[in-house]
Every structure is written in structure tokens, then in C-alpha cells.
């Protein structure tokens, strides 16, 4: 169940999609990727307060137990719920090729 | 790709499956679940150092960008890679029923 999307911590503080610009050097890809030279990496960042975008029953349990035992059980974490594919031009032994990666860019986020 | 399972932080410190004993009251379930009275909740807890159990390309990117921009990009997070089902006996309007939940107990863990 996709629970409440209202962030009690204030606008933009809770789990959501962010875009971080990164070069191939930043990503450690310069030795095997040719293009694009820069990637707009979409990733999930932000807090997961009680029931905010809870991905499933497990996330709800985690919230309850974190409240009881904060030193033992961490709060739910903001992670991708799904991904957008991205195509890279990459070096190969014989030249260059195209490869689509379907687990590279976050599409939307939830707490788990 | 399931990357290295060797924890550089010392035994048991990195992302792995933990079991936390919880009562129905702890979970906030006492008003709708009859049995079991206590649940051995398996959950994913621990640090995600560089490339440890990286779930996918996104996790690898996150590690790289966290190293560069630790205040902006969080480290990967330890979350369930899969779940074990659990059957609950629960109250209904007409009496009791059995219900299987397939997203309640973590089965194994990875970093994302």
C-alpha cells in the first residue's frame, strides 16, 4: 500500500526523487562508457517518518519497532520503487556497443 | 549483481538478516490479529559500505556519489531483497479468517 504522501517534516524533507548531475569520472565509468558524458542521476533521498510512503507491511512493522527500539531497529529507508531504463554507449573488446540498463535511474520512491 | 559479502567493518556489522521478537502490542496489531501472539520479525539491518551486497547498478552509483557528496547523497541502505510469507489469524466482521501476507518477513537482504 502506498501510504500518506504528506511530509510532516516540511516540504521536500521526506523521501522523494532527487536529481544529481554526475560525470563519467564521478561515477567511475570513464574507462568503459563513452556516452553520455554526463548523467542526470535520479535517486531517492529523504526521511521516512511514520507511514510516509510505506512500501508494504514490512515497512509498517519497521516503523512500529523503530519507535519502540530506536537503537536496535532503524527507521524505514528511502529507496527506489521502480526504475527508468537508460542506454549507454560503451566500449567493448571489438569497438563500441549500445546497452540498456534497467536498474540505473530511480523512477519513483518509497520507504522500506 | 550480488557484490561482495565480506564485511570490512567487522563480523555482523554489515547489512544482514536480523530477528527481532515482537508482540502484537509492539506491532500495533492487537486489535485485528488473534494469532500468533508473538512474531519473530526478520528484518534487514546493518551498514552498506562500498559495494557490499550492492543490489544493482543504482546501488553502485549511490556508493560512488556518496563518496563524492556525503552531505547530499546518502549511502546505500540495507533492505529486503525478498520476503518469506506469513499466515495470520485475524478478526473479521463475521468471525476469524486466515490471511497470508507475502511482504511481512524479510528473507534476505541487499544494499540499495
Amino acid at each position: 500500500a502506498r501510504n500518506g504522501d504528506h511530509c510532516p517534516l516540511g516540504p521536500g524533507r521526506c523521501c522523494r526523487l532527487h536529481t544529481v548531475r554526475a560525470s563519467l569520472e564521478d561515477l567511475g565509468w570513464a574507462d568503459w562508457v563513452l556516452s553520455p558524458r554526463e548523467v542526470q542521476v535520479t535517486m531517492c533521498i529523504g526521511a521516512c517518518p511514520s507511514q510516509f510512503r510505506a512500501a508494504n507491511m514490512h515497512a509498517q512493522i519497521k516503523t512500529s519497532l523503530h519507535r519502540l527500539k530506536p537503537d536496535t531497529v532503524p527507521a524505514p529507508c528511502c529507496v527506489p520503487a521502480s526504475y527508468n531504463p537508460m542506454v549507454l554507449i560503451q566500449k567493448t573488446d571489438t569497438g563500441v556497443s549500445l546497452q540498456t540498463y534497467d536498474d540505473l535511474l530511480a523512477k519513483d520512491c518509497h520507504c522500506i | 549483481a550480488r557484490n561482495g559479502d565480506h564485511c570490512p567493518l567487522g563480523p555482523g556489522r554489515c547489512c544482514r538478516l536480523h530477528t527481532v521478537r515482537a508482540s502484537l502490542e509492539d506491532l500495533g496489531w492487537a486489535d485485528w490479529v488473534l494469532s500468533p501472539r508473538e512474531v519473530q520479525v526478520t528484518m534487514c539491518i546493518g551498514a552498506c559500505p562500498s559495494q557490499f551486497r550492492a543490489a544493482n547498478m543504482h546501488a553502485q552509483i549511490k556508493t560512488s556519489l556518496h563518496r563524492l557528496k556525503p552531505d547530499t547523497v546518502p549511502a546505500p541502505c540495507c533492505v529486503p531483497a525478498s520476503y518469506n510469507p506469513m499466515v495470520l489469524i485475524q478478526k473479521t466482521d463475521t468471525g476469524v479468517s486466515l490471511q497470508t501476507y507475502d511482504d511481512l518477513l524479510a528473507k534476505d537482504c541487499h544494499c540499495i
Partner: antibody, heavy 119, light 107 residues
Framework: EVQLVQSGAEVKKPGESLKISCKGS????????ISWVRQMPGKGLEWMGI????????IYSPSFQGQVTISADKSISTAYLQWSSLKASDTAMYYC????????????WGQGTLVTVSS | DIQMTQSPSSLSASVGDRVTITCRAS??????LNWYQQKPGKAPKLLIY???NLQSGVPSRFSGSGSGTDFTLTISSLQPEDFATYYC?????????FGQGTKVEIK
């Protein structure tokens, strides 16, 4: 408006050379790749190859490797498809398409250039 | 190279019908598959990307599903403007390849 405008129809003789063009407008030309697609009369679509206009990296389908050359001039936001020696079997409609590497799809297409090769 | 096999190669249907077109890849391509619609004398138009994502501006009667080797394009209620040829396209890795097309004709 984002669009790709291709050069006009061509009628050529076997053995002649040809260069057709595809001009992008309404977007940053170097932020997307350009692909070329062939459609022979009454037939389906065939992927020919792709170019990254920013680095001029090209990748060809093996079926078209050595048969055509894909190039680009980013200063005028134009991609090209050229033949050094046309054959009658090159008679087809040729489409250029903008490739979004985010999402992996051809989202904007040119109107097509009909190339007829006949003696 | 990855071969893409579409079926049927043609079909006749009436306005309001539910139409299903399938596409099979010769090896797993995850969800790296697009669907295009082409009308006579026109350039192809993107309908679905990443197997199931509806392209902006495309009517919701179009939907895509599948992963791995088997994919489906469904038109829930065929409209007069939907009579066209439909192509699947794999972009898992180069060389990218199209299916041979499915022509949807008026019954």
C-alpha cells in the same frame, strides 16, 4: 517546437553517391542521439545505426556496417546518412529519429526521405 | 543478434474490439522493449516504452505488459484511428531490432 526535418526525396542511378540530412530544432541537439531507420517498399522497419552528435560515436547494425556512413555536424544540429555507391536495393524510405538515452526510446521522428535508385 | 517475432502478422477487428498483439524475443531482454504505431505514408509514433510505460499524449486504451522474452500490446477498445501497423522494438543491446509488424485492419 521539437522537430526533426529531413531533406527531400532523391532519385539516383546505381553507383552514384548520396548524402541525406536530418536537422534537429527546438532542443539541445547534443543532448540526444540520432538513429536511422530504413523501410523498404511495403516492408517493415529496420534499425540501421546510431550517432552521438556530441562525441560523434557511431554504432551500426551489422546489416548496414560498411554499406552506409552516419555522421553529424553539431554546429548546425544536423545528422547525415550517406552512401558512396548506391544500389537498386537501397530504394527505401529512410527515417531519422531522436533517441532519448533516459528511458531508451525514439520519441521524435523525421518525416522520412524517399530514396529511389533506378537505372 | 536478437530476433523479435510478432504475432499475428495481421488481424481484422471492429471498432470497440479488444486487440492483443504479442512479441517474442529470441533471448531475454528484461523490459527493454518499445511499441510503435505506423500509419501509411507516416513516420512511426512511440506508444509504449520500457514494456509498460505509456508515452505522454498516447490514449490510455493502449497498454503494454511483459518482461524477459514475452510481451503484449493491448488496445482495450479499438478506435477508427487505431487501424495501423504496430511494431515492437528491442533495445536491450545493439544491434537493436524491430519485429516484423502487425497490421490491424478493419473487419
Amino acid at each position: 517546437e521539437v522537430q526533426l526535418v529531413q531533406s527531400g526525396a532523391e532519385v539516383k542511378k546505381p553507383g552514384e553517391s548520396l548524402k541525406i540530412s536530418c536537422k534537429g530544432s527546438g532542443y539541445s541537439f547534443t543532448d540526444y542521439w540520432i538513429s536511422w531507420v530504413r523501410q523498404m517498399p511495403g516492408k517493415g522497419l529496420e534499425w540501421m545505426g546510431i550517432i552521438d552528435p556530441s562525441g560523434s560515436y557511431t554504432i551500426y547494425s551489422p546489416s548496414f556496417q560498411g554499406q552506409v556512413t552516419i555522421s553529424a555536424d553539431k554546429s548546425i544540429s544536423t545528422a547525415y546518412l550517406q552512401w558512396s555507391s548506391l544500389k537498386a536495393s537501397d530504394t527505401a524510405m529512410y527515417y531519422c529519429a531522436r533517441v532519448s538515452y533516459y528511458g531508451g526510446y525514439f520519441d521524435i521522428w523525421g518525416q522520412g526521405t524517399l530514396v529511389t535508385v533506378s537505372s | 543478434d536478437i530476433q523479435m517475432t510478432q504475432s499475428p502478422s495481421s488481424l481484422s477487428a471492429s471498432v470497440g474490439d479488444r486487440v492483443t498483439i504479442t512479441c517474442r524475443a529470441s533471448q531475454s531482454i528484461s523490459n527493454n522493449l518499445n511499441w510503435y504505431q505506423q500509419k501509411p505514408g507516416k513516420a512511426p509514433k512511440l506508444l509504449i516504452y520500457a514494456a509498460s510505460n505509456l508515452q505522454s499524449g498516447v490514449p490510455s486504451r493502449f497498454s503494454g505488459s511483459g518482461s524477459g522474452t514475452d510481451f503484449t500490446l493491448t488496445i482495450s477498445s479499438l478506435q477508427p484511428e487505431d487501424f495501423a501497423t504496430y511494431y515492437c522494438f528491442q533495445l536491450d543491446h545493439s544491434p537493436f531490432t524491430f519485429g516484423q509488424g502487425t497490421k490491424v485492419e478493419i473487419k
